[in-house]
C-alpha cells in the first residue's frame, strides 16, 4: 500500500527532513558544504548531488562564502543580504569561517603519515585526521589549505583529480571530495594460490555518505569554542577520540578482553565480543590477551594490513574471501564484487555497470561455488567479516541510487575499502 506523503520523511545525520525539503549537508571537517544540494525524495531517501556551476563570463569572478558558484562582480547580491558567518578562536588564534588550519596534539593515535586538519565553520572548529599521500620528492613543500606537504609542481594538492569533484568551501577554501586512492599492484588471481600484495591500509569504516568525504579522514572531533578540549571519551583516565576502540580496564578484573568499547563522539559504547561456536580445529586454545580461543599450529597467512586468527578469524569473527573483477569495453565498465560464504556454500556477486560515470545497471546474483570456480578474471582482494559486508551492502544501496542520477567516479572503489579489515593494534581487537 502507498505510504502517505505526510508520514514519509528522511533521516540525515540524525535530523528529520520533510519530503521535498532541500538543504546543504554539514560535512566534517568542512562544515556546511554549499556545493552540495540534498533533497528528501518521496520514498524517504536522501539524494545529494554536486552543484554544477555555470561558466562565468568575466575576468575576475568573486567567491561569496555562503554561495557555491563564483559570480561576476556586477551580479552580486546587495551588501545588506550578506550572511555574516561566525569566526572561531582556537589556541589563541582567530580563524575566519571556512578557513582551514593545522592543529597539533589532538589525536593520540595519529600515524606518522597523518596530520590533523581543522576548519572553522559557523563558529565551531572541526578537526579530522588526514592520511597524506606518499611523497615522491626529497623536498616537499607546505601549502596553505592542507596539513599535508606536497611535492612542488603537484598542483595545489597531490591527490588524484576527479573532474567536477571539488567542494568549494566558503572563503575560497577548497577540499576534494574523494578519498586518497592508494596505488597498488593488482593482487594475484584466485587460481594462483598465494596471497601476496593487497591494497594498503583501509581507514574507512561504515557507509560512505555522511562524513567520510575527505581524503583519508578517519575520525572527526568537534572543538567547541567555549570548551577548548575536544569531544572525546575518557575511560579509566585515558582519552579516546571519536571512533577509537579499546578494551575496558576494570579495577577488579584488569583488562576485559571480551568487551570492546568504542568512542562515539563523547559517549562510550561497549559491547561483548561473541566468539565462534564452531572452530576449524578440534582443540582451540585460550591465549592471554585474546578474548576468543584460537586454533594452535601454523599462523594463517597474513594479508598486509590485516590480522587473522588461524583459519581466517578476525577479532573472533569469521572471515570470508572477497573477489573482484573489473571489465571494460566500449566505454562501459562492469565491476563485480563477490563474497564467498560457507553457510550456505555459495558466492554472492554484486554487479555494477557504469558508463561515463553514471550507473547503468546494478544487480545481485547468487551462484554456487562450483559455478564461481568456472569464472575467470576474479581476483582475491581481501577477506572480510559479515558485519563489514553488511556495512558495504548498506552503503552500496545508497550509492546505487545516487550514482544512477549523477556522475560517480570513485564512490564504488571507495566503498570497497570498507571490506578491508584493520590490523588489530598490539594484538587487541
Amino acid at each position: 500500500e502507498q505510504v502517505k506523503h505526510s508520514e514519509t520523511y528522511c533521516m540525515f545525520q540524525d535530523k528529520k527532513y520533510r519530503v521535498g525539503e532541500r538543504w546543504h549537508p554539514y560535512l566534517e571537517p568542512y562544515g556546511l558544504v554549499y556545493c552540495v544540494n540534498c533533497i528528501c525524495s518521496e520514498n524517504g531517501n536522501v539524494l545529494c548531488s554536486r552543484v554544477r556551476c555555470p561558466n562565468v563570463h568575466c575576468l575576475s569572478p568573486v567567491h561569496i562564502p555562503h554561495l557555491c558558484c563564483p559570480r561576476c562582480p556586477d551580479s552580486l547580491p546587495p551588501v545588506n543580504n550578506k550572511v555574516t558567518s561566525k569566526s572561531c578562536e582556537y589556541n589563541g588564534t582567530t580563524y575566519q569561517h571556512g578557513e582551514l588550519f593545522v592543529a597539533e596534539g589532538l589525536f593520540q593515535n595519529r600515524q606518522p603519515n597523518q596530520c590533523t586538519q581543522c576548519s572553522c565553520s559557523e563558529g565551531n572548529v572541526y578537526c579530522g585526521l588526514k592520511t597524506c599521500p606518499k611523497l615522491t620528492c626529497a623536498f616537499p613543500v607546505s601549502v596553505p589549505d592542507s596539513c599535508c606537504r606536497v611535492c612542488r609542481g603537484d598542483g595545489e594538492l597531490s591527490w588524484e583529480h576527479s573532474d567536477g569533484d571539488i567542494f568549494r568551501q566558503p572563503a575560497n577554501r577548497e577540499a576534494r571530495h574523494s578519498y586518497h586512492r592508494s596505488h597498488y599492484d593488482p593482487p594475484p588471481s584466485r587460481q594462483a594460490g598465494g596471497l601476496s600484495r593487497f591494497p594498503g591500509a583501509r581507514s574507512h569504516r561504515g557507509a560512505l555518505m555522511d562524513s567520510q568525504q575527505a581524503s583519508g579522514t578517519i575520525v572527526q572531533i568537534v572543538i567547541n569554542n567555549k570548551h577548548k578540549h575536544g569531544q572525546v571519551c575518557v575511560s579509566n583516565g585515558k582519552t579516546y577520540s571519536h571512533g577509537e576502540s579499546w578494551h575496558p580496564n576494570l579495577r577488579a578484573f584488569g583488562i576485559v578482553e571480551c568487551v570492546l568499547c568504542t568512542c562515539n563522539v563523547t559517549k562510550q559504547e561497549c559491547k561483548k565480543i561473541h566468539c565462534p561456536n564452531r572452530y576449524p580445529c578440534k582443540y582451540p586454545q585460550k591465549i592471554d590477551g585474546k578474548c576468543c580461543k584460537v586454533c594452535p599450529g601454523k599462523k594463517a597467512k597474513e594479508l598486509p594490513g590485516q590480522s587473522f586468527d588461524n583459519k581466517g578469524y578476525f577479532c573472533g569473527e569469521e572471515t570470508m574471501p572477497v573477489y573482484e573483477s573489473v571489465f571494460m569495453e566500449d566505454g562501459e565498465t562492469t565491476r563485480k564484487i563477490a563474497l564467498e560464504t560457507e553457510r550456505p556454500p555459495q558466492v554472492e556477486v554484486h554487479v555494477w555497470t557504469i558508463r561515463k560515470g553514471i550507473l547503468q545497471h546494478f544487480h545481485i546474483e547468487k551462484i554456487s561455488k562450483r559455478m564461481f570456480e568456472e569464472l575467470p578474471h576474479f581476483k582475491l582482494v581481501t577477506r572480510t567479516t559479515l558485519s563489514q559486508w553488511k556495512i558495504f551492502t548498506e552503503g552500496e544501496a545508497q550509492i546505487s541510487q545516487m550514482c544512477s542520477s549523477r556522475v560517480c567516479r570513485t564512490e564504488l572503489e571507495d566503498l570497497v575499502k570498507v571490506l578491508y579489515l584493520e590490523r588489530s593494534e598490539k594484538g587487541h581487537c
Epitope: E329, V351, H361, H363, K366, I367, M371, L375, P376
Partner: antibody, heavy 120, light 107 residues
Framework: QVQLQQRGTELVKPGASVKLSCKAS????????MHWVKQRPGQGLERIGN????????NYNEKFKSKATLTVDKSSSTAYMQLSSLTSEDSAVYYC??????????????WGQGTTLTVS | DIQMTQSPASLAASVGETVTITCRAS??????LAWYQQKQGKSPQLLIY???SLEDGVPSRFSGSGSGTQYSMKINSMQPEDTATYFC?????????FGAGTKLELK
Amino acid sequence: QVQLQQRGTELVKPGASVKLSCKASGYTFTSYWMHWVKQRPGQGLERIGNINPSNGGTNYNEKFKSKATLTVDKSSSTAYMQLSSLTSEDSAVYYCARSKNNYVAYYFDYWGQGTTLTVS
Amino acid sequence: DIQMTQSPASLAASVGETVTITCRASENIYYSLAWYQQKQGKSPQLLIYNANSLEDGVPSRFSGSGSGTQYSMKINSMQPEDTATYFCKQAYDVPLTFGAGTKLELK
C-alpha cells in the same frame, strides 16, 4: 548486429570425428563466453561446455569431457567444437550460444541457428 | 545435479488468454533462472533471465516470477506468434540444467 553462423548439416560415419564451427560477428568476440548446447528430439537441451575466447580457457559438463573439445580462432572470430568417437547417440542439433556479459550466471542471449549432426 | 521439473508438458490457449508455465528446482537456485522460447525449426531465444528480468526486445506480455525452488513464467495475453516450446534453465550451479519443455499451442 550480433550473429553466430553455423553450418546447417553434417553427416558422418560412426567412430569418426567432426569439427563444428561457429563464426561470430557484430561484437567483440574475445569479450563473451561461447557455449555449446546439444538438443536431441525428446531429450531436451544440455550444455556441453564453454570457452573463454580471450585465453582459450574451457569448462566442460562432466558428461561430455571425453566427447567434446572446444577451441577458438581469434583471428577469424570462430569457435569450434570437435566431437570424437561418434555414435548414433551423438546425432542431434548442436548450438553455439553467447552468454550475457554483465551477469555471472550463464544466460544465453544469442544463439547460432544450429548444426544438425547425423551419425549414420 | 539440480533437476528442473517443468509443467505442464503441453497446453493450448486461445488468443488473449493468460498462460502460466511453472518450473520447480530440486534445490534453492536463488533466482538464477532463465526462460527460453523455441519456435519450430529455430534456435531458442532468451525471454527472461535472473527469474524476472525481461530481455531487450521481448514483448512486455511476458513476465517471470518466483523464488527459492518455485518459478513461473506468465504470458499475459496469448498471441498466435507465441506458439512455441518454452524451456526453463537453472544457472545457479554447474552443470546447467534445463526443464523438459512446455509445448504451447493455439486453441
